[in-house]
């Protein structure tokens, strides 16, 4: 049965061709009997809200790789399961990628919507990495590492719409220590809870922890960016992370509003509105050009909230790579 599930190729992380992971390999699911109940479970598992449809998986570009296998012939969920793995499944006997299942969930913004009120990852790069904080009676608490597990991290990541939890040994660095007066410990999650608050825990504020033991969690952040080639982290050629690969962004339509969103997301102050010449001093990138025609209003907290062409689709060369210079 699959150990992981994801949606690939959609305009956001909550729609796309259904892919499942078996023995470290990602493959597709045949759409035999695939229906809205199956999608409901998938959307729930991914923290993507309610199911909205079962579009053809072949809709999503680029298509599944030829060497990628169809791993499941049919899935039959009652609609109440927490994960696709809990549903009845048939092994593949006759299916091609033309019959790949697709899914669309009602909550496309889940990866960048205002985070659920009750939990947050603070002082990290973006909302999918950081120190775990839980709200209780209008007070934010940090969470002690005592009793913390990867299962608890899975719950947090799901709750925040941040994909799967990443195993990390990282601790809170000194400046990211909590300054909250009270904290929580002995979280005991099964990994299947909908929210961290559903996990059994020790009593609020009664523990022997200190802020050295604050818990740090990293999720499979659906989006990341960086500035490279500059003198510091706040200037350089813009690169975005997609499918584990860093790539550049084309400057078609790029302007002041897009600059501001990048600077804001990186915690780098305001854009210095560099001239065309200044932007070109970081040179062209290599490898993938991930984004083109990015359009922001300037209000966004993350570049992923801005409109853009589908990942990897562009009519650019690396001579058109975007560079951004922020105030620092």
């Amino acid at each position: 049965s699959p150990s992981g599930v994801r949606l690939v190729g959609g305009l956001h992380r909550c729609e796309g061709r259904v892919e499942v992971e078996q023995k470290g390999q990602w493959g597709t699911v045949c759409d035999d009997g695939w229906d809205i109940k199956d999608v409901a479970v998938l959307c729930r598992e991914l923290g993507c809200g309610a199911a909205s449809g079962t579009p053809s998986g072949i809709l999503y570009e680029p298509p599944a790789e030829k060497e990628q296998k169809v791993l499941i012939q049919s899935v039959s969920c009652t609609g109440t399961e927490d994960t696709l793995a809990q549903c009845e499944q048939e092994e593949v006997y006759d299916c091609s990628h033309d019959e790949d299942a697709g899914a669309s969930c009602e909550n496309p913004e889940s990866s960048f919507s205002p985070v659920p009120e009750g939990v947050r990852l603070a002082d990290g790069p973006g909302h999918c990495k950081g120190r775990v904080e839980v709200k209780h009676q209008n007070q934010w608490y940090t969470v002690c590492q005592t009793g913390w597990s990867l299962r608890a991290a899975k719950v947090v990541c799901r709750q925040l719409g941040c994909g799967r939890a990443v195993l990390t040994q990282k601790r809170c660095n000194k400046h990211a220590y909590g300054r909250k007066p009270i904290w929580l410990s002995q979280m005991s999650c099964s990994g299947r809870e909908a929210t961290l608050q559903d996990c059994p825990s020790g009593p609020w504020g009664k523990n022997t922890c200190n802020h050295d033991e604050d818990t740090w969690v990293e999720c499979e952040d659906p989006f990341d960016l960086r500035l490279v080639g500059g003198d510091n982290l706040c200037s350089g050629r813009l690169e975005v992370l997609h499918k584990g690969v860093w790539g550049s962004v084309c400057d078609d339509n790029w302007g002041e509003k897009e600059d501001q969103v990048v600077c804001k997301q990186l915690g780098c102050g305001k854009s210095l509105s560099p001239s065309f010449r200044d932007r070109k001093c970081y040179g062209p990138g290599v490898g993938r050009i991930w984004l083109d025609n990015v359009r922001c209003s300037g209000e966004e907290q993350s570049l992923e909230q801005c409109q853009h062409r589908f990942w990897g689709f562009h009519d650019c060369t690396h001579q058109e790579d975007v560079a951004v210079i922020c105030s620092g």
Epitope: P55, P62, F310
Partner: antibody, heavy 117, light 110 residues
Amino acid sequence: QSLEESGGRLVTPGTPLTLTCTVSGFSLSSYPMSWVRQAPGKGLEWIGIITSGGSIFYATWANGRFTISKTSTTVDLKITSPTTEDTATYFCARGYSSGTMMSSNLWGQGTLVTVSS
Amino acid sequence: ELVLTQTPASVSEPVGGTVTIKCQASESISTYLSWYQQKPGQRPKLLIYRASTLESGVPSRFKGSGSGTEYTLTISGVQCADAATYYCQQGYTYKNVDNAFGGGTEVVVK
């Protein structure tokens, strides 16, 4: 970036005809391509699509009557046995992006096919 | 079989008025809907995709909305240049599709 259809002409019923859509400025390995037709004074009618990966899908009425194929720079539509009802302007159109494949933001100017005895 | 029904077939509106065109799908198409404008003798032009996203360069007086089975194209402050036929198109599935387009709505501007 442009699309140009060619091959439209007057044919007699039953005579196979191949229309060609020649693309420039982008790669067919990155975009899905659709064929759409419009009979005189009528609405748009979707014929079929070939995805970037080469998968082909037809409208229910078009299956068996049309064949879509592609090379590195062209997309062909073969009308296997034209009838008078196939008289129309035929457009090729480029799919916009993932999850909006049938949203076409680039269209050819169309080529007119007239089937008459 | 997935079918798109467009209404009305024709609408006449004075300059500055508001035109509303509806497109109903026979089953939920989960916002996989586009709107096109076509003027006589011309190729279709994409206005809106994914139900509500305005294509680059399209005036903001065009607005798409809807979800599930019901979709609407609204043209506010209609202008003479908007006289054309408008089509909706689904991009939800290719299977068992007779026509991905709706029947069209002719807009006459008075």
